[in-house]
């Protein structure tokens, strides 16, 4: 049985340029202990989008709108979206390790597409 599930409920999100994009992620447990990070893309070349513990991410805010008894919300919102932000975003749980944290489980990803700004 899975110790923890990472749930990205939306396969895709479409946002007009200049607007904010909300990327949803829920987890069924805090255990195993370790941080949660957001990335764009997968593999070695992925780009870190948000890490609450360290770094400066001025366009990203955390959004925890709906508190459910059986899961934990780790959603984010990215402001002032541009076409360069298009891609697939992954919510990733890490397990605390020594000396480095170890990737434990990733969500299925949410593809962000950017529509032209309405004229």
């Amino acid at each position: 049985e899975d110790e923890l599930q990472v749930i990205q409920p939306e396969k895709s999100v479409s946002v007009a340029a200049g607007e904010s994009a909300t990327l949803r992620c829920a987890m069924t447990s805090l255990i195993p202990v370790g941080p949660i990070m957001w990335f764009r893309g997968a593999g070695a070349g992925r780009e870190l989008i948000y890490n609450q513990k360290e770094g400066h991410f001025p366009r990203v805010t955390t959004v925890s709108e709906l508190t459910k008894r059986n899961n934990l919300d780790f959603s984010i919102s990215i402001s002032n979206i541009t076409p360069a932000d298009a891609g697939t975003y992954y919510c990733v749980k890490f397990r605390k390790g020594s000396p480095d944290d170890v990737e434990f489980k990733s969500g299925a990803g949410t593809e962000l597409s950017v529509r032209a700004k309405p004229s």
């Epitope: 049985e1 899975d2 110790e3 923890l4 069924t28 447990s29 805090l30 255990i31 195993p32 202990v33 949660i36 609450q52 955390t62 959004v63 925890s64 508190t67 008894r69 059986n70 899961n71 934990l72 919300d73 780790f74 959603s75 984010i76 397990r95």
Partner: antibody, heavy 118, light 111 residues
Framework: EVQLVESGGGLVKPGGSLRLSCAAS????????MSWVRQTPGKGLEWVAT????????YYPESVKGRFTLSRDNAKNSLYLQMNSLRAEDTAVYYC???????????WGQGTTVTVSS | DIVMTQSPASLAVSLGERATISCRAS??????????MHWYQQKPGQPPKLLIY???NLESGVPDRFSGSGSRTDFTLTINPLQAEDVATYYC?????????FGGGTKVEIK
Amino acid sequence: EVQLVESGGGLVKPGGSLRLSCAASGFTFSSYVMSWVRQTPGKGLEWVATISSGGTYTYYPESVKGRFTLSRDNAKNSLYLQMNSLRAEDTAVYYCASQLTGSEFDYWGQGTTVTVSS
Amino acid sequence: DIVMTQSPASLAVSLGERATISCRASESVDSYGNSFMHWYQQKPGQPPKLLIYRASNLESGVPDRFSGSGSRTDFTLTINPLQAEDVATYYCHQSADLPWTFGGGTKVEIK
């Protein structure tokens, strides 16, 4: 109805060992993170140990690390706390508690008393 | 370790009045907009019982005269109006970071 029933407490000499058990019923035990929390009149509530739902991951505070071992048997809906090298400061009421999300303690047992004294 | 400081240690409130308990964490217990702060009630001879989870969410079956508020380091449990069966000791607890820690408790009595 959720029930957590602790057993195994008692009087033990310093340096001795005890094994506490917690029998769970009324919920899907294998889906829950489980913990032990102890309470003393002097120190209040203190978290003692936590185990993940599948039993892979365990966590302890420094005060018991290396002396206490937490395990579970999901087939038997049971939780076990092996306590070795007991000290006088381990004297407390020990509660078994469930955590659906590994966050707040949802349900608590009635507790079992451990007394470490010569 | 995150130190949880509860105040006051004891509180006497008239029936029907408001009881307010504070809990201050030595560092933020917030993560991704979640506040990992919880409140429990303990009556003599009984185990603690969950009242409020993640700062402000009422546990199922708990009367709505109990409410929780706060974020980051400062949190409040309010009982309004206080009833005779609310006489108990109340504890805050953080699960933001290991080791998980509890406040020292607030004993609520009837004035």
